[in-house]
């Protein structure tokens, strides 16, 4: 809002600055297309380029795509920020055997300590489990007695970590998701006791559910493994991630093992009706960038009329029909009224069907 500026003389005559009453000082006005990196920029270096969603400004001042964590064995560690990439790491119960820039090319399941061995250091996203020989009694290294129990007879000790990415995958190549699942199924068969119950080959009771992974004794990391493009919801069900395949949508966050993909309207559009994790109806943003100044009155709360530039004069504006009517093909819920000196209706076309599920924020 235009502020009361008791000290505006300090910025007077300098169009490159404005007065910020919150911090009570003159601030540098970032040029068009650049955005401040702090509340009250002081110099041009306090302004930066604005990248598209899912891009960040790298050290060379280039907009660079953030890595995605959409592979089933990865989770997001830090989000995509304006000046840093998203960082992915192996999901709980796994560690990274081949690292990649801001991510991991190959994740393996943590090893299970074989008979006669106990966990010295639990596995992390970066390191495999470290085992040590079991001493008589309970070792202090055991978080609980369960962690120190020897595997039941008949169990095949897991001497090597189990890969879930194809061995051919590299830092620059994302493994094929189908192949990943096959590798997981194979690993699941290999590391499960021959006479133990197995879900491999059985119909899944849950859509999108693939076989559960072997559970290291005493580990809390046993959970369902959902199919690609499904996630494990809060109720423990495999649920389909929303799709952003509509023309007017772009992916905001990827489908992860424990959260849905989220979609948003593409740049230049605004969400008129939301849907869970997405937008049911996107419309072109109806207000053009203002080129004119408000009439002298102080934007009174009643019946004030405003000068506005003619619609269609901005590159990202939809021209309004001369008669002010929306085209016959435009449904009533797809138009917004522009109220300037002459009220006109601005048609808002959309490629989206209006009757989409919209059951939450």
């Amino acid at each position: 809002f235009p502020q009361d500026r008791p000290f505006e003389d300090t910025c007077h005559g300098n169009p490159s600055h404005y007065y910020d009453k919150a911090v009570r000082r003159c601030c540098y006005r970032c040029p068009m297309g650049l955005f401040p990196t702090q509340q009250c920029p002081q110099r041009p270096t306090d302004c930066r380029k604005q990248c598209e969603p899912d891009y960040y400004l790298d050290e060379a001042d280039r907009c660079t795509a953030c890595v995605t964590c959409s592979r089933d064995d990865l989770v997001e560690k830090t989000p995509c920020a304006w000046n840093s990439s998203r960082v992915c790491e192996c999901r709980p119960g796994m560690f990274c055997s081949t690292s990649a820039v801001n991510s991991c090319a190959r994740c393996f399941f943590h090893s299970v300590c074989p008979a006669g061995m106990i966990v010295k250091f639990p596995g992390t996203a970066q390191k495999n489990t470290v085992c040590e020989p079991a001493s008589p009694g309970v070792s202090p290294a055991c978080a609980s007695p369960e962690n120190c129990k020897e595997p039941s007879s008949g169990t095949i000790p897991q001497a090597k970590p189990t890969p879930v990415s194809p061995a051919t995958s590299s830092a620059s190549t994302m493994p094929v998701r189908g192949g990943t699942r096959l590798a997981q199924e194979a690993a699941s068969k290999l590391t499960r006791a021959p006479d133990s119950p197995s879900s491999v080959g059985r119909p899944s009771s849950d859509p999108g559910l693939s076989p559960t992974q072997p559970c290291p004794e005493g580990s809390g990391d046993c959970r369902k493994q959902c199919e690609p493009d499904y996630y494990l919801d809060e109720a423990g069900r495999c649920t389909a991630c929303v799709s952003c395949s509509r023309d007017d949508l772009v992916e905001k966050t990827p489908c992860a093992w424990n959260s849905s993909r989220t979609c948003e309207c593409r740049p230049g559009m605004i969400c008129a009706t939301s849907a869970t994790n997405s937008c049911a109806r996107c419309v072109p943003y109806p207000i053009c960038a203002a080129e004119t100044v408000t009439k002298p009155q102080d934007m009174a709360e009643k019946d004030t009329t405003f000068e506005a530039p003619p619609l269609g004069t901005q590159p990202d504006c939809n021209p309004t029909p001369e008669n002010g009517e929306a085209p016959a093909s435009t449904s009533p819920t797809q138009s917004l009224l522009v109220d300037s000196q002459a009220s006109k209706t601005l048609p808002i076309p959309t490629s989206a069907p209006v009757a989409l599920s919209s059951t939450g924020k």
Partner: nanobody, 122 residues
């Protein structure tokens, strides 16, 4: 940090009026476009109206002729005057700053303020 506080909601009979206010803080220099959104029970977040920084206003068809959005820059406040209220206007109303940038996803309800509840019932 931008903070918004919505107020003015309440219980009103069909045909009645209410005036919602959205008090803003944390903006520097000229404020951005502002939008009112609403969320009815069990429904999605729906765009109601937008006011530009220079006072141009936009309304969805379901409220045009009944609702009026305005802003008082000296008070850093945006208003939504709601007349001829209908049962279908029952919702929690939220204001959102800079909808061009902030409201591309379906999450413009409740991100900045707690909202104010409007109930239209006889």
């Amino acid at each position: 940090e931008v903070q918004l506080v919505e107020s003015g909601g309440g219980l009103v009979q069909p045909g009645g009026s209410l005036r919602l206010s959205c008090a803003a803080s944390g903006f520097t220099d000229d404020g951005p476009d502002m939008a009112w959104y609403r969320q009815a029970p069990g429904k999605g977040c729906e765009l109601v109206s937008i006011i530009s920084a220079d006072g141009r206003t936009y309304y969805t068809d379901s409220v045009k002729g009944r609702f009026t959005i305005s802003r008082d820059n000296s008070k850093n406040t945006v208003y939504l005057q709601m007349n001829s209220l209908r049962a279908e206007d029952t919702a929690v109303y939220y204001c959102a700053p800079d909808p061009r940038r902030n409201c591309r996803g379906g999450d413009c309800c409740g991100n900045w303020g707690q909202g104010t509840t409007v109930t239209v019932s006889s």
